[in-house]
């Protein structure tokens, strides 16, 4: 798994307009990140979740569907 700043496993705010950047706070990193939509090349990156792009780091980040965890939302959350 990637680290929490690059691939936060907790839900954060998603951009309303997929073409625009937005600010959001991830629970794990406790810092503000600037997000945009992910490049389409990442359409299969998040297994059970939605992809967003960390603009400053140029890296994808997954916002997992409920009941899933992991950098790519690839694991079932046994505690859910």
């Amino acid at each position: 798994d990637g680290n929490s700043t690059r691939s936060p496993e907790t839900n954060g705010l998603l951009c309303g307009d997929p073409e625009e950047n937005c600010a959001a706070t991830t629970t794990q990193s406790k810092r503000k990140g600037h997000f945009s939509r992910c490049p389409k090349q990442y359409k299969h990156y998040c297994i059970k979740g939605r992809c967003r792009f960390v603009v400053a780091e140029q890296t994808p980040s997954c916002v997992c569907d409920e009941g899933y965890i992991g950098a790519r939302c690839e694991r079932v959350d046994l505690f859910y």
């Epitope: 939509r37 490049p39 389409k40 090349q41 990442y42 140029q58």
Partner: antibody
């Protein structure tokens, strides 16, 4: 400093195959995607690339079935094999490293290029 | 595939001139666009990534702007070493595609 060193020029017959190598030094080889880009008089053309996080190669539809891109982690070397060569495949072939671990973004390091000439 | 169209295909300019090259994508690519410079017999060199970010070591006279489908590379004051061919490249979707290039020549 990252360096990508490619194998030498090749002259091939139509219908044959060519395999070009790209040896990386000065960085962690399996941390970044490696792509192959060719340049003929028409301009630059992305052929495909290997993304470490996925482990498999992604190819441009145009070359699907004719190109194979592989990587040998033990020698920090990437390979591009193009089969069923035709005269239109005459070009300079570059390997290029992506600036990202996760996908193919900007190509921040390039090999010196390998001229492949296809002629009968 | 996403088509990238550059204009002009070539231009003549003098040292000190301000030069602008445009790149248009056939569909919106957000800001997932890079610019390269290439000199004869050499590999391309990354100038700008993510539409407007200057690559480390690249002179500040180079700048990029744009989002969506329309992008611009600007050289604020052309230097002798800037005479070259410039390419844009999108990385929104596979396959990665390049513009056809803009050759900047000496007037």
């Amino acid at each position: 400093q990252v360096q990508l060193v490619q194998s030498g020029a090749e002259v091939k017959k139509p219908g044959s195959s060519v395999k070009v190598s790209c040896k990386a030094s000065g960085g962690t080889f399996n941390d970044y995607a490696i792509s192959w880009v060719r340049q003929a008089p028409g301009g630059l053309e992305w052929m495909g690339g290997i993304i470490p996080i996925f482990g498999n190669a992604n190819y441009a539809q145009k070359f699907q079935g004719r190109v194979t891109i592989t990587a040998d982690e033990s020698t920090s070397t990437a390979y591009m094999e193009l089969s069923s060569l035709r005269s239109e495949d005459t070009a300079v072939y570059y390997c290029a490293r992506s600036s990202s671990t996760y996908g193919i973004h900007a190509f921040d390091y390039w090999g010196q290029g390998t001229l492949v000439t296809v002629s009968s | 595939d996403i088509q990238m169209t550059q204009s002009p295909s070539s231009l003549s300019a003098s040292v000190g001139d301000r030069v602008t090259i445009t790149c248009r994508a056939s569909q919106s690519i957000s800001n997932f666009l890079n610019w390269y410079q290439q000199k004869p017999g050499k590999a391309p060199k990354l100038l700008i990534y993510a539409a407007s970010n200057l690559q480390s070591g690249v002179p500040s006279r180079f700048s990029g702007s744009g989002s969506g489908t329309d992008f611009t590379l600007t050289i604020s004051s052309l230097q002798p070493e800037d005479f070259a061919t410039y390419y844009c490249q999108q990385y929104d979707d596979f396959p990665m595609t390049f513009g056809q290039g803009t050759k900047v020549e000496i007037k």
